[in-house]
């Protein structure tokens, strides 16, 4: 089942996605679609990156963070219903059926007031419950333990106040990711 | 050719008000996070503030936070930055500077303006 | 908050190795990016992505990153490598750009 977010229109959607490259500068290819992931690469692309860079974007959608260190969270800028559905980020791992794969669903719900045309905080409501740990092994996914006791009324809450970035990457402290090689 | 041009800066005495302009050729400006960078004189560079493509989303260094506004015309190809209240430490060297491709925040700076110097004495 | 630190002067002879250092809590853990700046001009990004060079930017240039140092290496340093550089990173926590302070290039003779 997919992990799902909450964002409302006129927002910005912040949907997470971490590996850990196997060393400094190898990085695995990613895309990012709309739609679940099928048996091979991404259906309907918004973005993609290579061994190096981002070599395909399309407007409102952009990486959120360092993605040559791992982080290839995606932000979608100015939300419409229209965006919601689910969202494949997929880690095209070397070898044959290697790929990571994680449907995430985003669910847009109707803004309660009208949102400011320019913001300098910008947040998705709602943090996964699953995350994919860390391993050696094939990636696992379980509730981290790890995680901070915190509820998902309570995230929504601390997440007018806290950047999506900073929770982002207090989640990954926790382990959140997977490791590559 | 990317090209960035700086225009506005000038004297202005401390409190005053000033707008920077930087027109932007040579890319889609829509496509890439921007940035103000400014250096005072003989000194380092600071971060001022950076702003989206789509220009729905700003930042703003500490020191400027509340007085400086950093906005974007993507019609017209042109990044603003509002410069209110200022001080005289608010002198230096402004560039506006293009992030790179396809990250929300411009990660680093691929390109540079060749500055417009704001002066702020009475 | 993050700070980096840069020494704020290294000197080198014509045709050595120059390595200029940026230290960071974990800086591993981030992308480091260099800019050259000679007087009165703009900066110039020389190294992106710790290791990256830019187009046009001689292969004498390179980067690494590790634990809590990033160093730029400039081999067979020319009189031309003469400038002000700065090493940046971007930090999520606060989604601040950060600079180091600077380190001046000296070539000597």
């Known amino acids: 089942s997919e992990v799902e977010y909450r964002a409302e229109v006129g927002q910005n959607a912040y949907l997470p996605c971490f590996y850990t490259p196997a060393a400094p500068g190898n990085l695995v290819p990613v895309c990012w679609g709309k739609g679940a992931c099928p048996v091979f690469e991404c259906g309907n692309v918004v973005l993609r990156t290579d061994e190096r860079d981002v070599n395909y974007w399309t407007s409102r959608y952009w990486l959120n963070g360092d993605f040559r260190k791992g982080d290839v969270s995606l932000t979608i800028e100015n939300v419409t219903l229209a965006d919601s559905g689910i969202y494949c980020c997929r880690i095209q791992i070397p070898g044959i059926m290697n790929d990571e794969k994680f449907n995430l669903k985003l669910v847009i719900k109707p803004a309660k007031v009208t949102p400011a045309p320019t913001r300098q905080r910008d947040f998705t409501a709602a943090f996964p419950r699953m995350l994919t740990t860390r391993g050696h092994g094939p990636a696992e996914t379980q509730t981290l333990g790890s995680l901070p006791d915190i509820n998902l009324t309570q995230i929504s809450t601390l997440a007018n106040e806290l950047r999506d970035s900073r929770l982002a990457n207090d989640l990954r402290d926790s382990g959140a990711t997977i490791r590559i090689g | 050719e990317v090209q960035l041009l700086e225009s506005g800066g000038g004297l202005v005495q401390p409190g005053g008000s000033l707008r920077l302009s930087c027109a932007a050729s040579?890319?889609?400006?829509?496509?890439?996070?921007m940035s103000w960078v400014r250096q005072a004189p003989g000194k380092c560079l600071e971060w001022v503030s950076a702003i989206s493509g789509s220009g729905g989303s700003t930042y703003y260094a500490d020191s400027v936070k509340g007085r400086f506004t950093i906005s974007r015309d993507n019609s017209k190809n042109t990044l603003y930055l509002q410069m209110n209240s200022l001080r005289a430490e608010d002198t230096a060297v402004y560039y506006c500077?293009?992030?790179?491709?396809?990250?929300?925040?411009?990660?680093?700076?691929?390109?540079w303006g060749q500055g417009t110097l704001v002066t702020v004495s009475s | 908050s993050y700070v980096l630190t840069q020494p704020p002067s290294v000197s080198v002879a014509p045709g050595k190795t120059a390595r200029i250092t940026c230290g960071g809590d974990?800086?591993?853990?981030?992308?480091v990016h260099w800019y050259q700046q000679k007087p009165g001009q703009a900066p110039v990004l020389v190294i992106y992505?710790?290791?990256d060079r830019p187009s046009g930017i001689p292969e004498r240039f390179s980067g690494s990153n590790s634990g809590n140092t990033a160093t730029l290496t400039i081999s067979r340093v020319e009189a031309g490598d003469e400038a002000d550089y700065y090493c940046q990173v971007l930090d999520r926590r606060s989604d601040h750009f950060l600079f180091g302070c600077g380190t001046k290039l000296t070539v000597l003779g």
């Open positions: 974990n800086i591993g853990g981030k992308s």
């Open positions: 992505y710790d290791s």
């Open positions: 040579g890319f889609t400006f829509s496509s890439y996070a």
């Open positions: 500077a293009r992030g790179s491709y396809g990250t929300y925040y411009g990660n680093y700076f691929e390109y």
